[in-house]
Structures are given as structure tokens and as C-alpha cells.
């Protein structure tokens, strides 16, 4: 099978505002013009799709309007940002890349990025 290598960081810590960013890089065997990127979350052996986008090489990634993901592409790199994360969203986020066109079709799946999310402490009431 034509498996494509996909690299992503092992660990990322979300910001205090619940935003996590990481780079997903793929070793393209061909001259792809259309690429599909999917972010999967694995927790407790359950895998769910977080978001997905198809983009033309050289163009921006377009996620659905209500998506928690945004991203930009540069060559064979995709910069992904996931927003609105809370502590319960901590888990392994896997980058899946598909070269959709022209044929042949290629699929690559990264090893996953463990995203840690820590809910911010509530601000204490202040007496003045």
C-alpha cells in the first residue's frame, strides 16, 4: 500500500484560553493539487473526527463555519489551530492527510499529538 509519512509533534500544551496549535507535515510522493486534512481525537480507545478541510495547494484551508479548527498551509506543511478546548478535551489528536487529486490516492496518518488542556483557575473575588 502507498502509505505516506506524516509527522506531528508528540506533545502540545493548550494556552490558558483553550487554544492549541501544531504543525502537521507530510512527505508528498506526488504533485498533489488537492489535499484533505482531518483531525481525529483518540481518547479511551474511541476515535472521533474533530474537523476536516480540503484545500488546493497554495490556498488556505477552509473548515466549516462552525468548526473549532482553523489552519494555514505552506508547501507540505499544515499549521492547525484548535480552539475552545477545555480540560475534558485533553487527548491524542491525530493528523490524517489524504492526497485526493491527481491520482493516485495517498493516505498518511500521524502518530498523534497529545494535547493537554488545563482549565484556568477562576479569578478570586477581590474586596476593595
Amino acid at each position: 500500500c502507498k502509505a505516506m509519512h506524516v509527522a506531528q509533534p508528540a506533545v502540545v500544551l493548550a494556552s490558558s484560553r483553550g487554544i492549541a496549535s501544531f504543525v502537521c507535515e507530510y512527505a508528498s510522493p506526488g504533485k498533489a493539487t488537492e489535499v484533505r486534512v482531518t483531525v481525529l481525537r483518540q481518547a479511551d480507545s474511541q476515535v472521533t473526527e474533530v474537523c476536516a478541510a480540503t484545500y488546493m495547494m497554495g490556498n488556505e484551508l477552509t473548515f466549516l463555519d462552525d468548526s473549532i479548527c482553523t489552519g494555514t498551509s505552506s508547501g507540505n506543511q499544515v499549521n492547525l489551530t484548535i480552539q475552545g478546548l477545555r480540560a475534558m478535551d485533553t487527548g491524542l489528536y491525530i493528523c490524517k492527510v489524504e492526497l485526493m487529486y491527481p491520482p493516485p490516492y495517498y493516505l498518511g496518518i500521524g502518530n498523534g499529538t497529545q494535547i493537554y488542556v488545563i482549565d484556568p483557575e477562576p479569578c478570586p473575588d477581590s474586596d476593595f
Epitope: M56, M100, P103
Partner: antibody, heavy 122, light 111 residues
Framework: EVQLLESGGGLVQPGGSLRLSCAAS????????MSWIRQAPGKGLEWVSG????????DFADSVKGRFTISRDNSKNTLYLQMNSLRAEDTAMYYC???????????????WGQGTLVTVSS | QSVLTQPPSASGTPGQRVTISCSGS????????VYWYQQLPGTAPKLLIY???NRPSGVPDRFSGSKSGTSASLAISGLRSEDEADYYC????????????FGGGTKLTVL
């Protein structure tokens, strides 16, 4: 049942136009790239054009470039081939085919329609 | 003229093993998978082999494919009369304007 059904072929004069359609059923059409392939009478298969699953990318054989356009309507599960400035050498059976994939495997053109005959003659 | 080269004809008797060759170059077969299609008389082509040697479900194991360098071959063992058809090889080509390339086809006759 996974199926492709072509229509729109017929007899047309040189210089004329035709629009072929390919109706897909039994699978998620918007997930697959598609191709048109033709076969002149008594001859072999010739790839004509291809289009990505979103419709954003297209390719054409040199023999039809500038004369044919490929498009798709994913809401109607239909693939199209607009053929302009037709020539006698475009006479052929035209097939649409799905570019299949499963898991890590590219499966080539795994589903074909029955074809529609285009005859260009005066 | 086709990008991939196949013999125009091949023949065999029932029960025999026949092989059909397909020759290409480094930009197609040399760097991509090969696919084989069977076209019975008066019908549309049907996928026979994908990814050099894989059979879709429903294709008998009498059909097998292989690839070496810039050439590929389709072997049919235990030849049957219903195998009489045209066989086409196909690959992808990174050097051409169109990504899909076919062989010229081989007419298999069962004697």
C-alpha cells in the same frame, strides 16, 4: 448497488457540441474523483479528462484540451462532460469511471458506466 | 500511440496459463502502481487487478498481476472460454499533462 449511468450521446455534425452526463448512485459521490474515458470503434481505451472530488481540480488529455470541459454537481450526484468544436476523431463510446480508494489503497477506476456513444459525422 | 506497450494479441487453449505483458517507463510504471481491466465483447471495462497484484472481490484467483521495474504482467491460469476478452493495463504518469495512461490493449483468444 454502486452504479454509474451515462447519457447525452448521439449524432452531431463536425464543429457541433454535446453535453454528456453521468449519474452516480449507491455511493458517496462527493468523496470520489471521477474520470471520462473514451473508446473509438475497434480501438483501445483513451483517458479524456478527470476531476477531483470537490471539483476544484481538473485535467484534460492534450487531444481535447481547450474544447472539452469537465464539471460535477455533488448535490445532484452527477458528472458532466461538455464537448465543443467536435471532430470526426472524437467519435467514440464515452465512459465515466470512479477513481476508487479504500484504506491506504488507490483502487484505480473501480466502477464504470455502460457508456454513451458519440458519433461526429456530416 | 499508447504510452504503455502491450502485445496486440495473445492466445491459449482451455486450462493453459497465459501471460500478457505491459511495458512503460520510470515516470509511470516505474514509480506507480499498475491496474488491469478486462473488457468482454460489447461491454464496459471491469477492474481486474489494482495496486499491481490485488484482486477486487469477485475476481477469481486465476487472475494474478505482478510488476518488476518498468514492466508489469497479467497472468491467467486455468484458461476458460469466458476469459476471451480485451485486457488493458493502466498506470499513472507524473510527466504528462494527464495523470492516467493506458496500454493499447491485448486481445486474448481462447482456442
Amino acid at each position: 448497488e454502486v452504479q454509474l449511468l451515462e447519457s447525452g450521446g448521439g449524432l452531431v455534425q463536425p464543429g457541433g457540441s454535446l453535453r454528456l452526463s453521468c449519474a452516480a448512485s449507491g455511493f458517496t459521490f462527493k468523496a470520489y474523483s471521477m474520470s471520462w474515458i473514451r473508446q473509438a470503434p475497434g480501438k483501445g481505451l483513451e483517458w479524456v479528462s478527470g476531476i477531483s472530488n470537490t471539483g476544484g481540480s481538473t485535467d484534460f488529455a492534450d487531444s481535447v484540451k481547450g474544447r472539452f470541459t469537465i464539471s460535477r454537481d455533488n448535490s445532484k450526484n452527477t458528472l458532466y462532460l461538455q464537448m465543443n468544436s467536435l471532430r470526426a476523431e472524437d467519435t467514440a463510446m464515452y465512459y465515466c469511471a470512479r477513481l476508487g480508494y479504500s484504506g491506504y489503497d488507490d483502487r484505480g477506476m473501480d466502477v464504470w458506466g455502460q457508456g454513451t456513444l458519440v458519433t461526429v459525422s456530416s | 500511440q499508447s504510452v504503455l506497450t502491450q502485445p496486440p494479441s495473445a492466445s491459449g487453449t482451455p486450462g493453459q496459463r497465459v501471460t500478457i505483458s505491459c511495458s512503460g517507463s520510470s515516470s509511470n510504471i516505474g514509480s506507480n502502481y499498475v491496474y488491469w481491466y478486462q473488457q468482454l465483447p460489447g461491454t464496459a471495462p471491469k477492474l481486474l487487478i489494482y495496486g499491481n497484484s490485488n484482486r477486487p472481490s469477485g475476481v477469481p484467483d486465476r487472475f494474478s498481476g505482478s510488476k518488476s521495474g518498468t514492466s508489469a504482467s497479467l497472468a491467467i491460469s486455468g484458461l476458460r472460454s469466458e476469459d476471451e476478452a480485451d485486457y488493458y493495463c493502466q498506470s499513472y504518469d507524473s510527466s504528462l499533462s494527464g495523470p492516467v495512461v493506458f496500454g493499447g490493449g491485448t486481445k486474448l483468444t481462447v482456442l
